[in-house]
Interface confidence: medium
């Protein structure tokens, strides 16, 4: 058939939906690949065509938009399932074309099963709450566009398997779930089940997210360098291995980029003509405070290296700090004969 700009399989959009629930999937062409929207394309006389390849098959097939009760339909740039079936899993393609223009992209759709406690292979979004910070809310995600504002759905919230009723610090408020004060014990999976009527049928939307309680910005401090410090002196003889750890504590800060780096004589180690290796390890506390350790290593240190300035730097959204390591050349013990000779006044 005619040439078509093929964007291939967009694996960034690994769409997962629950079996036997409605799903609305927008054609990714207009969201990620083209510079114009569906309305513009439609006005210009371009046609949006959908087709799919079933799981474990190579054959491209049209989507049957003529199923009983309109189970699969298309509305503008949205493909609708009312509801999904397990065998809807496959790669879906939307193709935009007319006689002179063609562009298409495929994306994988996986219909997954859930158990009675909402466990499933679904990848869960994570919502972070600040510890002991006051009232915070999570909102039932990805339910926009499923029903008009005139429809009032019923929403039931669960923590794990348990319906949230009479919890001390967690209160369901429609599409929102309010945490009066968040504790580590509030970590876990929370599920909202949205039930709404449409054309004499009842549909359910299940949305699960993971709540992670993290350090509060009220308690956040600039990075703290635990090592190097003034109490430790790195005394080495030439030829020995020099190991200096830089250990930095970072308070949890939402969307902060935590950085640790060494300078040697004010330059990056890569810009110094010595054989330096730096190994990093990271650990987290329960509230996602972070401790980063960067160990600077020089296998065979020279007397020149021992005269250099070694400074550990750290930066977060809260500020930047630096600390120099105290590095010295070990003074060798005097040789016995010389010492004696000097002691007895020998010339």
């Amino acid at each position: 058939s005619e040439r078509c700009d093929d964007w291939g399989l967009d694996t960034m959009r690994q769409i997962q939906v629950f079996e036997d629930e409605p799903a609305r999937i927008k054609c990714p062409l207009f969201e990620h690949f083209l510079k114009f929207n569906y309305s513009t394309a439609h006005s210009a006389g371009l046609t949006l065509i959908w087709y799919w390849t079933r799981q474990d098959r190579d054959l491209e097939e049209p989507i049957n938009f003529r199923l009983p009760e309109n189970r699969i339909s298309k509305e503008k740039d949205v493909l609708w399932f009312r509801p999904t079936l397990l065998n809807d899993t496959g790669n879906y393609t939307c193709m935009l074309r007319n006689t002179t223009y063609c562009s298409k992209v495929a994306f994988p759709l996986e219909v997954v099963q859930k158990d009675s406690c909402f466990n499933s292979p679904m990848k869960l979004p994570v919502h972070k709450l600040y510890i002991e910070y006051g009232i915070q809310r999570i909102t039932c995600p990805n339910v926009d566009g499923y029903f008009p504002s005139s429809v009032k759905p019923t929403i039931t919230w669960y923590m794990g398997c348990y319906k949230i009723q009479n919890f001390n610090n967690v209160i369901p408020e429609g599409m929102n779930l309010s945490f009066l004060i968040a504790f580590i014990s509030n970590n876990g999976n929370y599920t909202c089940v949205v039930t709404y009527p449409e054309n004499g049928r009842t549909f359910h939307l299940t949305r699960t997210l993971t709540v992670k309680v993290v350090g509060s910005p009220k308690n956040a401090v600039p990075p703290v360098i635990h090592s190097p410090n003034d109490h430790v002196v790195y005394e080495k003889e030439p030829g020995e291995e020099l190991l200096i750890p830089c250990t930095v504590y970072f308070s949890f800060l939402m969307d902060s980029r935590n950085e640790v780096w060494w300078t040697i004589d004010g330059k990056k180690p890569d810009d110094i003509p010595i054989d330096v290796t730096i190994n990093e390890s990271i650990s987290h506390s329960r509230t996602e405070d972070e401790t980063r350790t960067q160990i600077l290593s020089i296998k065979k240190v020279t007397s020149e290296d021992l005269k250099r300035s070694y400074v550990c730097h750290a930066r977060s959204a809260k500020g930047e700090v630096a600390k120099a390591a105290t590095v010295k050349q070990k003074v060798p013990a005097p040789r016995y004969t010389v010492e004696l000779a000097c002691g007895f006044g020998a010339t």
Epitope: S1, H42, G45, T47, I49, Y51, E60, E61, P62, N64, F65, R66, L67, P68, E69, N70, S73, K74, E75, W80, R82, M95, R97, N98, T99, E198, N199, G200
Partner: antibody, heavy 119, light 108 residues
Framework: QVQLLQSGAEVKKPGSSVKVSCKAS????????IDWVRQAPGQGLEWMGG????????NSAQNFQGRITITADKSTNTAYMELSSLRSEDTAVYYC????????????WGQGTMVTVFS | EIVLTQSPGTLSLSPGERATLSCRAS???????LAWFQQRPGQAPRLLIY???RRATGIPDRFSGSGSGTDFTLTISRLEPEDFAVYYC?????????FGGGTKVEIK
């Protein structure tokens, strides 16, 4: 402007088959569904089935299944509807219609082919 | 299958009058996949309205469609001589595609 041109009238005997063609001109043929609708004399419209030429997959109404074959030839921009085991109640005008670009409704129709079945 | 019932069977009106044609579905027509066609004697049907209320290319604005769920209406605000014909509603979202029995608009 897209046009659908159908083959000429047919007179058939009961038990035989008829194959009606529908040739598209003036636009992209393969990406739209071509459907078949019939109308018995003095009666309403009845959907028979359709095909999307780009994929070659047909689907048809249950009361025609086993008797109807819908095919398409992309090289000649032509769709075909073959109806077998003809009976007198199959006497009707048979229309092809394009399942439209912007609407999904039948926006362009052929002129119709009269098929008469009698012994 | 979705059964479409059109009423009235015949509508006798004069040019310039308003025509209101009804189409009732046995099941809800979701996604607004409902169309109206006009058929004049000896001619193929012509698409007037699709998606319940959207006018097809070249259709004058005296034709309008409305409704949702199971009840749909085609309104011709002022009848012109060429509007006297048979009108069919059709749902095209659910297989099998079905047409209503038609309403004949005739000159009084």
């Amino acid at each position: 402007q897209v046009q659908l041109l159908q083959s000429g009238a047919e007179v058939k005997k009961p038990g035989s088959s008829v194959k009606v063609s529908c040739k598209a001109s003036g636009g992209t043929f393969s990406i739209y569904a071509i459907d078949w609708v019939r109308q018995a004399p003095g009666q309403g419209l009845e959907w028979m089935g359709g095909i999307i030429p780009i994929f070659g997959t047909e689907n048809s109404a249950q009361n025609f299944q086993g008797r109807i074959t819908i095919t398409a030839d992309k090289s000649t921009n032509t769709a075909y509807m073959e109806l077998s085991s003809l009976r007198s109640e199959d006497t009707a005008v048979y229309y092809c219609a394009r399942n439209g670009a912007t609407s999904d409704a039948f926006d362009i129709w052929g002129q119709g082919t009269m098929v008469t079945v009698f012994s | 299958e979705i059964v479409l019932t059109q009423s009235p069977g015949t509508l006798s009106l004069s040019p310039g009058e308003r025509a209101t044609l009804s189409c009732r579905a046995s099941l809800s027509v979701s996604s607004n996949y409902l169309a109206w066609f006009q058929q004049r004697p000896g001619q193929a049907p012509r698409l007037l309205i699709y998606g319940v209320s959207r006018r097809a290319t070249g259709i004058p604005d005296r034709f309008s469609g409305s409704g949702s769920g199971t009840d749909f209406t085609l309104t011709i605000s002022r009848l012109e001589p060429e509007d006297f014909a048979v009108y069919y509603c059709q749902q095209y979202g659910s297989s099998p595609l079905t047409f209503g029995g038609g309403t004949k608009v005739e000159i009084k």
